[in-house]
C-alpha cells in the first residue's frame, strides 16, 4: 500500500519545510486515494473482463452511486463554493457503504482497499473542518446502508464483479471532479 499523505520520504528528508495548508492537505489526500483506486482497478481488470464492459451496460445499473451534476455547483459554469463543498462531503459519505462493500473483494490488494476506505474517512474529516454549513450535509441512514450492503453481498459472482468495477470507476470520477472543484476554492 502507498504511504499515507504526510508520511512520505520527502517529508522525512525535509523536516524544516513549511507545514501543508488545509487545501494542500486535502489535495494530497485525494491524490493518494486516487492512486489507491488505480491499484484496485488494476487487480479488478486483471481478474475479469469487466473493464471492457460498454458504457451502455454500466449505465444500465440499479446502483445509486453519487455523481456530480450541474446543480451541485462544482463545475466551472455556475460554480458555487458552499453548495459544491456540501455536495462533495455528502457524496463521500454516500460512497462509504460502497467502500465497505469493496473490503472483501480483493486478494492481493486487500490492504489497498482498506487504505482507500480509511483515507476517505480522513478526507471527510478534513472537508468537514473546511465547511461552514454543516447542517446542510445529510448523513446516510445506517439501517438503509446495512440493508444495501447485505443486498450487494447477496448478488451472484458476475454482478459482484460488475458492481466492484462500477464503484471504482464512479468513485474515481467523483474524486477527480472534487479535486478540480476544490482547486478553485
Amino acid at each position: 500500500a502507498p504511504v499515507p499523505p504526510g508520511e512520505d520520504s520527502k517529508d522525512v528528508a525535509a523536516p524544516h519545510r513549511q507545514p501543508l495548508t488545509s487545501s494542500e492537505r486535502i489535495d494530497k489526500q485525494i491524490r493518494y486515494i486516487l492512486d489507491g483506486i488505480s491499484a484496485l482497478r488494476k487487480e479488478t481488470c486483471n481478474k475479469s473482463n469487466m473493464c471492457e464492459s460498454s458504457k451502455e451496460a454500466l449505465a444500465e445499473n440499479n446502483l445509486n452511486l453519487p455523481k456530480m451534476a450541474e446543480k451541485d455547483g462544482c463545475f466551472q459554469s455556475g460554480f458555487n463554493e458552499e453548495t459544491c463543498l456540501v455536495k462533495i462531503i455528502t457524496g463521500l459519505l454516500e460512497f462509504e457503504v460502497y467502500l465497505e462493500y469493496l473490503q472483501n473483494r480483493f486478494e492481493s490488494s486487500e490492504e489497498q482497499a482498506r487504505a482507500v476506505q480509511m483515507s476517505t474517512k480522513v478526507l471527510i474529516q478534513f472537508l468537514q473542518k473546511k465547511a461552514k454549513n454543516l447542517d446542510a450535509i445529510t448523513t446516510p441512514d445506517p439501517t438503509t446502508n446495512a440493508s444495501l450492503l447485505t443486498k450487494l453481498q447477496a448478488q451472484n459472482q458476475w454482478l459482484q464483479d460488475m458492481t466492484t468495477h462500477l464503484i471504482l470507476r464512479s468513485f474515481k470520477e467523483f474524486l477527480q471532479s472534487s479535486l478540480r472543484a476544490l482547486r478553485q476554492m
Epitope: S53, E56, A57, L58, E60, N61, N62, N104, R105, F106, E107, E110, K151, Q153, A154, Q155, N156, Q157, W158, L159, Q160, M162, L166
Partner: antibody, heavy 119, light 111 residues
Framework: EVKFEESGGGLVQPGGSMKLSCVAS????????MNWVRQSPEKGLEWVAE??????????YYAESVKGRFTISRDDSKSSVYLQMNNLRAEDTGIYYC??????????WGQGTLVTVSS | DIVLTQSPASLAVSLGQRATISCRAS??????????MNWFQQKPGQPPKLLIY???NQGSGVPARFSGSGSGTDFSLNIHPMEEDDSAMYFC?????????FGGGTKVEIK
Amino acid sequence: EVKFEESGGGLVQPGGSMKLSCVASGFSFSNYWMNWVRQSPEKGLEWVAEIRLTSNKQAIYYAESVKGRFTISRDDSKSSVYLQMNNLRAEDTGIYYCASLFYDGYLHWGQGTLVTVSS
Amino acid sequence: DIVLTQSPASLAVSLGQRATISCRASESVGNFGISFMNWFQQKPGQPPKLLIYTASNQGSGVPARFSGSGSGTDFSLNIHPMEEDDSAMYFCQQSKEIPWTFGGGTKVEIK
C-alpha cells in the same frame, strides 16, 4: 463434463441428525460457489444453503427455514461440499441436490439423495 | 426475497403446437443489461436440467425449439414445435441474488 455425486441420505427420526456429502468433478471446484437445493412435493424446489469462496474468504448463506440447524462446509482439496443437518423435522423430507452456481448465475445439479424424516 | 410466480400450473399442448409458460418476479432480476432468469426442465426421477440461462441463452445441447424471452420482471419460455419428449415439469429460477428462488412449476403434457 460437470458431475456431482451426492451421498448420505436415508431415513432419520425427527430430532435426529444426518450428514450429506457431494463430490464434484469436471470443473475447477475451488472457484465456484456451492449450494444445496431440496425438492419436495409440498414445497417444490427450495434453495437450502450456499458456501462461497470470494478472494480467499468464505461466505455462507442459509435459507431462513434451516438457519441454526444446518451447516454447509467444503473441502476444496477433495472437491467436496457437505451439509450437516441437525434437529431434523418432517418438513425437511425431500430430495437434496448438490448444485454449483456458475459465474453468470445458472445452476448445475447432481442426481440427488433422498432424505426422509419420519418416526 | 424475490418471489417467482409461474403460470399456468399445467398445460396440455398438441404435437407441433406452441407451449408458452410465464414467470413473473416480485422485483427486477436484471442489472447491467442482463436478466438473471433461468429455465429448467425436469422429468420424473431426474434432476432439473438447464434449458435457458440469463433469460434467453440456450444451455449446451438444448434443442432450438426451446427459447426464452423477457426482461426485468416478466419472462416466458416457449416450446415450438412441441414434441413427445417435451412432456415434463418446467421451472423458472432467479440467480440474481441470494436466496436463489424458484417458480412453483408448470406441468406440460401432450394433448
